[in-house]
């Protein structure tokens, strides 16, 4: 808390300008009027106030707007945004995408905090949460903006939150945006992607859908195997185990194309390991890769899950 001291003669700020950079903290507190600051917020970011001076400016705005800042002030916060706590931000009503962009831009790549300069800031998460809740859904423009700043943003959402993503927004998603998504999240995103890209032709469709395939069911993988897609091993390894198990050796061979040779290197890892255990050794031998662990010849395979379904 900065002490209340009288402003020295001749130092009262008539406008927000570069001369204030040389004011000590107590002089900023005493000589800068909060209302002047609020009306000239656009100038604050043009002046390189230090981290400590920003404390004073924030204190003045907090006194002026105890119920939360208006958007006219928020959109010009600039570096001052990084002084805001999640509690401060929860009082805001941010509706403009331009405001969101401006604040995310400020946060991008700046070593702001003495405590944890490289950690993602909690106030950013709160800001995004407030903005998305205000909009009601993650529309394409918002998603475009968020994934541009935070490629991992989508994967930070729960499956429930992802359900509010309209299929049209999926066009904004890049492969790297899904790198950290788990199967539960891909289960939600895959049907949306399938719907979004349904009018594309075979090869173009595969390029777009590829990074979502961790949520694909068996029947879709079977359909892809008929389209000469040549799926790479990295994509195959991310497929749902339960979706891969029912595929035949011939279907996997068609699905992977020339990449089928990569199965040998992955034979001890899921889903390849589990899939091998379900195949006849005879069929595996047709691949000529030396894959071992299939069902020996002459053994009868009972699919108990199918039996249960029938009864």
């Amino acid at each position: 808390e900065v002490e209340k001291t009288a402003c020295p003669s001749g130092k009262k700020a008539r406008e927000i300008d570069e001369s204030l950079i040389f004011y000590k903290k107590w002089e900023l507190e005493a000589c800068v009027d909060a209302a002047l600051l609020a009306t000239q917020m656009d100038r604050v970011n043009a002046i390189p106030f230090t981290y400590e001076q920003l404390d004073v400016l924030k204190h003045k705005l907090d006194e002026l707007y105890p119920q939360g800042y208006p958007e006219s002030v928020i959109q010009h916060l600039g570096y001052l945004f990084l002084k805001m706590s999640p509690e401060d931000i929860r009082k805001w009503n941010v509706t403009s995408l331009e405001t969101l962009k401006a604040l995310l831009e400020v946060n991008k790549g700046h070593e702001m905090s003495p405590q944890a300069p490289r950690r993602p800031l909690p106030q950013v998460a709160t800001l995004i949460d407030r903005f998305v809740k205000g909009r009601g859904q993650l529309d394409k423009d918002t998603l475009d903006t968020l994934t541009a700043f935070y490629p991992g943003y989508l994967c930070s959402l729960s499956p429930e939150e992802l359900s509010s993503v309209p299929p049209s927004s999926i066009w904004a998603v890049r492969p790297q945006d899904l790198d950290t998504c788990d199967p539960r999240q891909l289960d939600v995103l895959y049907p949306k992607a399938r719907l979004a890209f349904q009018n594309m032709n075979g090869s173009e469709y595969f390029v777009k859908i590829q990074s979502f395939l961790g949520g694909a069911p068996t029947e879709d993988l079977k359909a892809l195997s008929q389209q000469n897609v040549s799926m790479d091993l990295a994509t195959f390894m991310k497929l749902r185990t339960d979706a891969v198990l029912p595929l035949t050796v011939a279907e996997v061979q068609k699905l992977l194309g020339p990449h089928v040779e990569g199965l040998k290197a992955e034979e001890r890892h899921r889903p390849v390991r589990d899939w091998i255990l379900r195949q006849r050794q005879d069929d595996l031998d047709t691949l000529g890769l030396g894959l071992q662990g299939g069902i020996p010849n002459g053994y009868l395979v009972l699919d108990l899950s199918m039996q249960e379904a029938l009864s």
Epitope: E18, I21, Y51, E52, Q53, Y79, G109, H110, E111
Partner: antibody, heavy 120, light 107 residues
Framework: QVQLQQSGAELVKPGASMKLSCKAS????????MHWVRQAPGQGLEWIGA????????IYYQKFKSRVTLTVDKSISTAYMQLSSLTSEDTAVYYC?????????????WGQGTTVTVSS | DIQMTQSPSFLSASVGDRVTITCRAS??????LAWYQQKPGQAPKLLIY???TLQTGVPSRFSGSGSGTEFTLTISSLQPEDFATYYC?????????FGPGTTVDMK
């Protein structure tokens, strides 16, 4: 990578003025404040002032305010520092430097320095 | 203006030594303090900021501590390439000010 290439050494007479240049590359020139710092022989470092290439906003240390002018030419990503009424006390190595985060004014990148000798 | 002082001004040490340099500020600067290394004929190089955060690429034998008015730079095991002059700089308020420097030379 970020590079700040400064102009060559200068020998100037007392009372004259000089204009040093600092050509930036490897980053968006208009994004960051360009600062100037000097170092007299065997002495410490002394901050002079700064300019923001996008807005032309300037801040000057009071000690130099009446004698220094900072400018930029955005078209060639170059910053200039002009210092007038030179005395032998201005003999120093002059550095340009950029600060990535203005609210955390540590000097992230430096030019190689320009040696200025003021002598009759 | 905030005045910065450093001690010692000169320090003779050997490779492998633990070296400690102190920097004092005339006013409280919180943790708004940086350390630089400068070798003859070269520009200063940022080592540490926020008093203790190591700049990317700087060896972990360098460390910083302190807050308020008293700060230290420590080199845990001096290497041949560490013989240089070290400066502290406060960035709590303008004008930005530096300490006078500490020269570390070979014993």
């Amino acid at each position: 990578q970020v590079q700040l290439q400064q102009s060559g050494a200068e020998l100037v007479k007392p009372g004259a003025s000089m204009k040093l240049s600092c050509k930036a590359s490897g980053y968006t020139f208009t994004s960051y404040w360009m600062h100037w710092v000097r170092q007299a022989p065997g002495q410490g470092l002394e901050w002079i002032g700064a300019i923001h290439p996008n807005s032309d906003n300037t801040i000057y240390y009071q000690k130099f305010k009446s004698r220094v002018t900072l400018t930029v030419d955005k078209s060639i990503s170059t910053a200039y520092m002009q210092l007038s009424s030179l005395t032998s006390e201005d003999t120093a190595v002059y550095y340009c430097a950029i600060i990535i985060t203005p609210v955390v004014p540590k000097f992230d990148y430096w030019g190689q320095g320009t040696t200025v000798t003021v002598s009759s | 203006d905030i005045q910065m002082t450093q001690s010692p001004s000169f320090l003779s040490a050997s490779v492998g030594d633990r070296v400690t340099i102190t920097c004092r500020a005339s006013h409280d600067v919180g943790t708004s303090l940086a350390w630089y290394q400068q070798k003859p004929g070269q520009a200063p190089k940022l080592l540490i900021y926020w008093a203790s955060t190591l700049q990317t690429g700087v060896p972990s034998r360098f460390s910083g501590s302190g807050s308020g008015t008293e700060f230290t730079l420590t080199i845990s095991s001096l290497q041949p390439e560490d013989f240089a002059t070290y400066y502290c700089q406060q960035y709590s308020s303008y004008p930005l000010t530096f300490g006078p420097g500490t020269t570390v030379d070979m014993k």
